[in-house]
């Protein structure tokens, strides 16, 4: 059993439950966004393909001091099999493109909703 959901989860859960909760957290962020998310911080864009969870974490972990995405960072760590630290990059980053965190979250949310609808939970 894997502890999907990382520190945000109360214990081991099925992959579909962890993905559902990650989607809801991203919905929460987009709904509650008043001022620019994370003060308009920019992050590397990623390819939304296999290995996407680690790539998303690698991108977002470089944003510090933004409480709005801390839970998302913890949840993404539950989907990524290796430890991710700031400054770490994989080949999944589009290294010539930076986007605002708010746009990154919206893009990630749309993609995860699509995966969820299609039953791709792993």
């Amino acid at each position: 059993l894997t502890c999907l959901g990382g520190f945000a989860s109360p214990g081991p859960v099925p992959p579909s439950t962890a993905l559902r909760e990650l989607i809801e957290e991203l919905v929460n962020i987009t709904q509650n966004q008043k001022a620019p998310l994370c003060n308009g911080s920019m992050v590397w864009s990623i390819n939304l393909t296999a290995g996407m969870y680690c790539a998303a974490l690698e991108s977002l972990i470089n944003v510090s001091g933004c409480s709005a995405i801390e839970k998302t960072q913890r949840m993404l760590s539950g989907f990524c099999p290796h430890k991710v630290s700031a400054g770490q990059f994989s080949s999944l980053h589009v290294r010539d493109t930076k986007i605002e965190v708010a746009q990154f979250v919206k893009d990630l949310l749309l993609h995860l909703k699509k995966l969820f609808r299609e039953g791709q939970f792993n």
Epitope: V13, P14, S16, T17, E24, V27
Partner: antibody, heavy 118, light 107 residues
Amino acid sequence: EVQLQESGPGLVKPSETLSLTCTVSGGSITSDYWNWIRKPPGKKLEYMGYISYNGNTYYNPSLKSQITISRDTSKNQLSLKLSSVTAADTAVYYCARLAKWTWYFDIWGQGTTVTVSS
Amino acid sequence: DIQMTQSPSSLSASVGDRVTITCHASQNINVWLSWYQQKPGKAPKLLIYKASDLHTGVPSRFSGSGSGTDFTLTISSLQPEDFATYYCQQGQSYPYTFGGGTKVEIK
């Protein structure tokens, strides 16, 4: 103690839209996940979909073109709409709660019987 | 979708009997299985989740076991209030699916 109560017309004509309401008492629909499940006579329980505490929805792909789940937070109610119904939609309809980070239904309504017939 | 198959579909037993109901999943669902009890005209009640964890307030005569694809619900000593229909449900992936039910009747 959270309680759920389904309500709606017991008879719906073929090709019309089935509309049901689930009233939640003792808890808020802005917490957890609120689901619709049905049981056609002689068939298995069928999971239909949910509306989340955020208002986000998921629908069983087998019902995707037919189903809409919505909510009214001021009344603490969720609703189910099923369009273009046929006799195959005759069933007992249940609403049920699923808590965050869980995958099982810990509270159910009594169910309401809907017959599709002309 | 994951198919859930319950057996038997019905059984007759007496008060005090040990009753066993099985549930088979069409693919590996780890321990993400729950059991419900339903009496006629009543709401289903959660009995067991995560294959073997007893829900709050459920008597200890109910127990669950299994992992992967094969699961069992056992009532160690059947009581008059246990005559009902029992359902299994998988929580491995959406859409969640249920077994066809097992009706436990009085012999």
